[in-house]
C-alpha cells in the first residue's frame, strides 16, 4: 500500500511540476521592469524566453517575438535549451510512469518491468527538474549581473552628454514558477525512485529451506516467487525467506517454514 501511495504521489507531484515547467517556459514574465528607486515610466516592460512585451499605461500591451536565432544571447539560448530538454524528459517520464503505475495493469507485465519503468521515469523526472532549476537559475544570474551593471551605469553615467532612462530588470513571476515546478518535478522523481525499491524483487532468489537436526533430510521449496493472481491482489513477486516475512502490501498468505512439498 505504501509503495502504491509513494508511486502515485510521485506521479502526481511530477505531473504538477512538469505542467509548471511548461507554464514557466511559455510565460512572458521572466524578467520585469524594476520599479523600485527608478524613474517611473508610463510603460512597463517585461520579457520572456520567446518575446518581449510592453504594456502602456492604458493597459494596451504589445508583444514582439524574438525573430532571430543567431542574434540572441548565448545564455538565453542555453536557458531555452535547458527548459525544452526538461519538458521533453518530463513528458517522456510521464508517459513511462503511467505504464509503470502499480494500480494500472497492462497485460501480463512483469513487476520487475514495472520497477524498471518506475526507476526510469524517476530518473527522468529528476533530470527534468534539474534542467528546469538550472535554466531558471542561469537566467536569474544573468538578470542579477545585468541589474548591477545598469545600476552602475545609472549612477556613474555613460560618459556621454545625453542621459538615458535606464530600464533595469528584476525577477519575473516565471522564475518563481520555474523554481517551484523544477523542485516539484525533482521531488516527484525521488519519490518514484523510492517507490521502485519497494516494487523491485530482491536480486537473490532465496529458497525456503527446512533444516533438520540430523542434517540429512532437506526439503526445498521450488519456485521462490509467488505469482500475482490478478487485479487488486498482491502484484509484487515476494520472496520467501524462512517462510516469507510479510510486508504491509501483501494480501495473500504465504507458506510458512512448515509447509513442505
Amino acid at each position: 500500500m505504501a509503495v502504491t501511495a509513494c508511486q502515485g504521489l510521485g506521479f502526481v507531484v511530477s505531473l504538477i511540476g512538469i505542467a509548471g515547467i511548461i507554464a514557466a517556459t511559455c510565460m512572458d514574465q521572466w524578467s520585469t521592469q524594476d520599479l523600485y528607486n527608478n524613474p517611473v515610466t508610463a510603460v512597463f516592460n517585461y520579457q520572456g524566453l520567446w518575446r518581449s512585451c510592453v504594456r502602456e499605461s492604458s493597459g494596451f500591451t504589445e508583444c514582439r517575438g524574438y525573430f532571430t536565432l543567431l542574434g540572441l544571447p548565448a545564455m538565453l539560448q542555453a536557458v531555452r535549451a535547458l527548459m525544452i530538454v526538461g519538458i521533453v524528459l518530463g513528458a517522456i517520464g510521464l508517459l513511462v510512469s503511467i505504464f509503470a503505475l502499480k494500480c494500472i495493469r497492462i497485460g501480463s507485465m512483469e513487476d520487475s518491468a514495472k520497477a524498471n519503468m518506475t526507476l526510469t521515469s524517476g530518473i527522468m523526472f529528476i533530470v527534468s527538474g534539474l534542467c528546469a532549476i538550472a535554466g531558471v537559475s542561469v537566467f536569474a544570474n544573468m538578470l542579477v549581473t545585468n541589474f548591477w551593471m545598469s545600476t552602475a551605469n545609472m549612477y556613474t553615467g555613460m560618459g556621454g552628454m545625453v542621459q538615458t532612462v535606464q530600464t533595469r530588470y528584476t525577477f519575473g513571476a516565471a522564475l518563481f514558477v520555474g523554481w517551484v515546478a523544477g523542485g516539484l518535478t525533482l521531488i516527484g522523481g525521488v519519490m518514484m525512485c523510492i517507490a521502485c525499491r519497494g516494487l523491485a524483487p530482491e536480486e537473490t532468489n532465496y529458497k525456503a529451506v527446512s533444516y533438520h537436526a540430523s542434517g540429512h533430510s532437506v526439503a526445498y521449496k521450488p519456485g521462490g516467487f509467488k505469482a500475482s493472481t490478478g487485479f487488486g491482489s498482491n502484484t509484487k513477486n515476494k520472496k520467501i525467506y524462512d517462510g516469507g516475512a510479510r510486508t504491509e502490501d501483501e494480501v495473500q498468505s504465504y507458506p510458512s517454514k512448515h509447509d513442505y512439498v
Epitope: 521592469q33 524613474p39 517611473v40 515610466t41 508610463a42 510603460v43 516592460n45 520579457q47 518581449s52 512585451c53 510592453v54 502602456e56 499605461s57 492604458s58 493597459g59 494596451f60 504589445e62 514582439r64 545625453v162 542621459q163 538615458t164 532612462v165 530600464t167
Partner: antibody
Framework: QVQLQQPGAELVNPGASVKVSCKAS????????MHWVKKRPGQGLEWIGG????????NYNHKFKGKATLTVDKASSTAYLQLSSLTSEDSAVYYC????????????WGQGTVVTVSA | DIVMTQSPSSLTVTAGEKVTMNCKSS????????????VTWYQQKPGQPPKLLIF???TRESGVPDRFTGSGSGTDFTLIISSVQAEDLAVYYC?????????FGSGTKLEIK
C-alpha cells in the same frame, strides 16, 4: 465619438478651493486615463496629473502635489480636479484630456475651464 | 524632470512652404523594449484645446493630414509640415509621454504671411 464636457469658467476668491468637472460621453469611461493640463496665458502647457477611473490609480506632477486632487465618479462618468488654497498663479485654463488606448498620448480634449482667482 | 526644448519659438511662412520644427529632450525617450520613442506632437489653434497630431514620434493620428510628418529618435525629434496651409496657423507642442511627470515643450508658434 468621445466628448469631454467642461464648465466654461469658474471665478473664485484667493485662498478658496475650486472643483472643476469633466464629463465623458461616447466611450467606456473606466478604460482610459483622464489627465489634467494647465495653460496659463503666454505660457506653455503643464501636465498636472492623471487618474485611471477603473481603480482610481493616479500619477501627479510633483509640482502640483498638495495643490491638486484628482477624483472620479464612475456612476456619472465624471472626472474632477480640485484645486486648493488658490492664488493668482492658479489663474489659468484647465483642460481635461482622455488618454488614448494604444499609447500614452492625450487623444481627446475638453474645451477647457477658465479659472480666475480674484478678490 | 525631463526638459523638452523646442526651436524655433516662432516662425512665419507663406502658404505652400515646407516647415520644420525641432524638439530636443534632456533624456532619451526611446523605450528599448519596443524600440518606440515616446514623443507626442500637439497642435493648438487659437481659442481651442490642443489636438493630437503625432504619437510615438512618427505615427500619425487618424484624420490628421499626411502633410504632417514626425521623425527622430532618442533625444532629437522633428515635426515637418510639407506644404503649409492657412488653417495650420497654431502653436505646436511636443510632449514627453514616457517618464513621469509628462512634460511639454514651450511650443513653436506658426504664423502665416
Amino acid at each position: 465619438q468621445v466628448q469631454l464636457q467642461q464648465p466654461g469658467a469658474e471665478l473664485v476668491n484667493p485662498g478658496a478651493s475650486v472643483k472643476v468637472s469633466c464629463k465623458a460621453s461616447g466611450s467606456t469611461f473606466t478604460t482610459y486615463w483622464m489627465h489634467w493640463v494647465k495653460k496659463r496665458p503666454g505660457q506653455g502647457l503643464e501636465w498636472i496629473g492623471g487618474i485611471r477611473p477603473s481603480d482610481s490609480n493616479n500619477n501627479y506632477n510633483h509640482k502640483f502635489k498638495g495643490k491638486a486632487t484628482l477624483t472620479v465618479d464612475k456612476a456619472s462618468s465624471t472626472a474632477y480636479l480640485q484645486l486648493s488654497s488658490l492664488t493668482s498663479e492658479d489663474s489659468a485654463v484647465y483642460y481635461c484630456a482622455m488618454g488614448a488606448y494604444y499609447s500614452n498620448s492625450f487623444a481627446y480634449w475638453g474645451q477647457g475651464t477658465v479659472v480666475t482667482v480674484s478678490a | 524632470d525631463i526638459v523638452m526644448t523646442q526651436s524655433p519659438s516662432s516662425l512665419t511662412v507663406t502658404a505652400g512652404e515646407k516647415v520644420t520644427m525641432n524638439c530636443k529632450s534632456s533624456q532619451s525617450l526611446l523605450n528599448r523594449g519596443n524600440q518606440k520613442n515616446y514623443v507626442t506632437w500637439y497642435q493648438q489653434k487659437p481659442g481651442q484645446p490642443p489636438k493630437l497630431l503625432i504619437f510615438w514620434a512618427s505615427t500619425r493620428e487618424s484624420g490628421v493630414p499626411d502633410r504632417f510628418t514626425g521623425s527622430g529618435s532618442g533625444t532629437d525629434f522633428t515635426l515637418i509640415i510639407s506644404s503649409v496651409q492657412a488653417e495650420d496657423l497654431a502653436v505646436y507642442y511636443c510632449q514627453n509621454d514616457y517618464v513621469y511627470p509628462f512634460t511639454f515643450g514651450s511650443g513653436t508658434k506658426l504664423e502665416i504671411k
